[in-house]
Interface confidence: low
């Protein structure tokens, strides 16, 4: 499950449920 980007969502975060593979981890989105 990917979280929807918004203006407050940083490009890279340590997060849960936002990566394409990890449930939690350091996730970078381009």
């Amino acid at each position: 499950r990917r979280r929807r980007r918004d203006t407050h969502f940083p490009i890279c975060i340590f997060c849960c449920g936002c990566c394409h593979r990890s449930k939690c981890g350091m996730c970078c989105k381009t």
Partner: antibody
């Protein structure tokens, strides 16, 4: 070719601040989706993830050590840094830096490329 | 923190043996598990990521399986160069490593 190399003080005393440097080549921390992590391994023991920094300066820390850790980077010199405050003998370990796998902009904590490690001893 | 328990801690096997290493998580980590090989004096090397994906350049005798809390690393035919310590690593939440399984030749 991706390479990483750690450097540090070798020996320091309890209560001091440990400063570590990871110098790398073959990739840039200004590239989208690239991150660098620090991991340590006490002599003869297991591995412990410490911190991760990514290309646009976001950071993740091990919760149990977060108040003692600071990760940073110097993009132009291809370096990442880790500071650990108030060190104790329990911080004696080999310290590794590593680069997680990168999936075209998605970088997670699947640590792929590792440096050879630097031994740090805390002793009075 | 999620605890990772590896068994056995020491395993002796012969060349050509099929070897199975176990890793158990204290709670559900889905498939967010890697296996690393560490030879004496060297840095860890990624063998398997996301439970069963073989990292590039790793021999096909290595395979991984599992889901949830129980995971396995299998070496289908043990080779002398496989002598090492093997660590599992979860990155589902607050990344943690297991204590390792030391694999030696009989």
């Amino acid at each position: 070719q991706v390479t990483l190399k750690e450097s540090g003080p070798g020996i320091l005393q309890p209560s001091q601040t440990l400063s570590l440097t990871c110098s790398f080549s073959g990739f840039s921390l200004s590239t989208s989706g690239i991150c660098v992590s620090w991991i340590r391994q006490p002599s003869g023991k297991g591995l412990e993830w410490l911190a991760t920094i990514c290309w646009e300066d976001s950071k993740g820390y091990n919760p149990s050590l977060k108040n003692r850790l600071t990760i940073s980077k110097d993009t132009s010199n291809n370096q990442a840094f880790l500071k650990i405050t108030s060190v104790d003998t329990a911080d004696t370990a080999i310290y590794y830096c590593a680069r997680p796998l990168n999936y075209g902009g998605y970088s997670e904590l699947e640590l792929d490329y590792w440096g050879q490690g630097v031994m740090v001893t805390v002793s009075s | 923190d999620i605890q990772m328990t590896q068994s056995p801690s020491l395993l002796s096997a012969s060349v050509g043996d099929r070897v199975t290493l176990s890793c158990k998580a204290s709670q559900n980590i889905y498939k967010y598990l890697n296996w690393y090989q560490q030879k004496l004096g060297e840095a860890p090397k990624l063998l398997i990521y996301y439970t069963n994906s073989l990292q590039t350049g790793i021999p096909s005798r290595f395979s991984g399986s599992g889901s949830g809390t129980d995971f396995t690393l299998t070496i289908s035919s043990l080779q002398p160069e496989d002598v090492a310590t093997y660590y599992c690593y979860q990155y589902n939440s607050g990344p943690t490593f297991g204590a390792g399984t030391k694999l030696e030749l009989k």
